[in-house]
Amino acid sequence: GIAIPRNSGCPNSEDKNFPRTVMVNLNIHNRNTSTNPKRSSDYYNRSTSPWNLHRNEDPERYPSVIWEAKCRHLGCVKADGNVDYHMNSVPIQQEILVLRREPRHCPNSFRLEKILVSVGCTCVTPIVHHVA
Amino acid sequence: GIAIPRNSGCPNSEDKNFPRTVMVNLNIHNRNTSTNPKRSSDYYNRSTSPWNLHRNEDPERYPSVIWEAKCRHLGCVKADGNVDYHMNSVPIQQEILVLRREPRHCPNSFRLEKILVSVGCTCVTPIVHHVA
């Protein structure tokens, strides 16, 4: 059932067993979600496993803008600027919670969703499989 | 303001720009733990900027456990296993959304919160400041 606030200190729910629909307060302490990570640091450019940041925009999601990292090279950049293919640039992934509008276009009705995002890249030694 | 459902198909909101309090359906899309990729890679060990994962635990937050990456070295690990201090291991940070009960112990009222977490580390060329 839809959660409708009553007189008590807690919002009440029509569903006595479990509130599948809850109230979420979006007064986030730090609400400026679409901050471009390029501004916070230039690691994406200075890394030995540099990455490009792709803007993933979805007006039906909160936050509507998520930045996805895509490694620039298969290998890693050496001091001379050349790429060393004996090493691998790999994305570091993180699972995050987002809100998705549901039904679509409803301004204040959402569904909680977990998504996997690539945050940046790191340079790793490859796993070498020896064939007998 | 509190979002109260009206007669239309969508719950209404007092804030026309962006609702402060929204309805959230908790039937999460990616519910099964088995589909939760817990970063099942050993990049943290194989990286040239390896990191340790530290537990950040808060029982009043979901997720209750978040893993924070702490770079093992100031420098980066070379092919011979030694640390190169002419390069820097730096944390890659990501802002994530978490849910907090508010008021505490109310079963169907939550507050969305943003926290900054270190997801992993990358190896970067240092910024050299030349003194005149």
Epitope: P19 | S40, D42, E57, P59, S64, V65, W67, P107
Partner: antibody
Framework: QVQLVQSGAEVKKPGSSVKVSCKAS????????ISWVRQAPGQGLEWMGS????????NYAQKFQGRVTITADESTSTAYMELSSLRSEDTAVYYC??????????WGQGTLVTVSS | DIQMTQSPSSVSASVGDRVTITCRAS??????LNWYQQKPGKAPKLLIY???SLQSGVPSRFSGSGSGTDFTLTISSLQPEDFATYYC????????FGQGTKVEIK
């Protein structure tokens, strides 16, 4: 200090159901999951499924899908595990455990369920 | 399901001995590996989480190592209260446990 206290031993007939309870004392469930793990006599540990009481999200091991139901009552800080269509091989000690979704850090004392005709 | 294989299935040791138990995952699980101790008639107790982190209140003689598919639990100097069964458990996927290793008195 979190303590999980489980209901007492049960003797059940094949084909019947059993419902085991797990009460969190010394605090609420908080945002953790509660998992159920069983151990047949002289055997190892087997995860059955979990619930996050805050949200009511459940996740069941494939083996028990359709036969196990995990619920939670936040007002009493109690989780329940119901297993239906019992057979003799379901004779085991059933444990509830607080589950961070990474490890089980607090366990109930266990409930012995015996299935016998 | 990810299969967890422990070895040995049992080990006889004396007080003061160094005991090593290994656990192998059927696929890479990063560091999402935990170790539990269980005594007869009791519930399991978490010793090590995330492959190498010591759970609070657990003596420092217990240590864990490994990453990917191969993991080790080491008891540096066996104490009388350490005679028990030890289980590894992965949580990279739906949780699965190893079959257990019984540490017995020699």
């Amino acid at each position: 200090q979190v303590q999980l206290v489980q209901s007492g031993a049960e003797v059940k007939k094949p084909g019947s159901s059993v419902k085991v309870s797990c009460k969190a004392s010394g605090g609420t469930f908080s945002s953790y999951a509660i998992s159920w793990v069983r151990q047949a006599p002289g055997q190892g540990l087997e995860w059955m499924g979990s619930i996050i009481p805050w949200f009511g999200w459940t996740n069941y091991a494939q083996k028990f899908q359709g036969r196990v139901t995990i619920t939670a009552d936040e007002s009493t800080s109690t989780a329940y595990m119901e297993l239906s269509s019992l057979r003799s091989e379901d004779t085991a000690v059933y444990y509830c455990a607080r589950d961070s979704e990474y490890y089980f850090d607090h366990w109930g004392q266990g409930t012995l369920v015996t299935v016998s005709s | 399901d990810i299969q967890m294989t422990q070895s040995p299935s049992s080990v006889s040791a004396s007080v003061g001995d160094r005991v090593t138990i290994t656990c192998r995952a059927s696929q890479g699980i990063s560091n999402w590996l935990n170790w539990y101790q269980q005594k007869p008639g009791k519930a399991p107790k978490l010793l090590i989480y995330a492959a190498s982190s010591l759970q609070s209140g657990v003596p420092s003689r217990f240590s864990g190592s490994g990453s990917g598919t191969d993991f080790t639990l080491t008891i540096s100097s066996l104490q009388p209260e350490d005679f028990a069964t030890y289980y590894c458990q992965q949580y990279s996927d739906d949780p699965t446990f190893g079959q257990g290793t019984k540490v017995e008195i020699k």
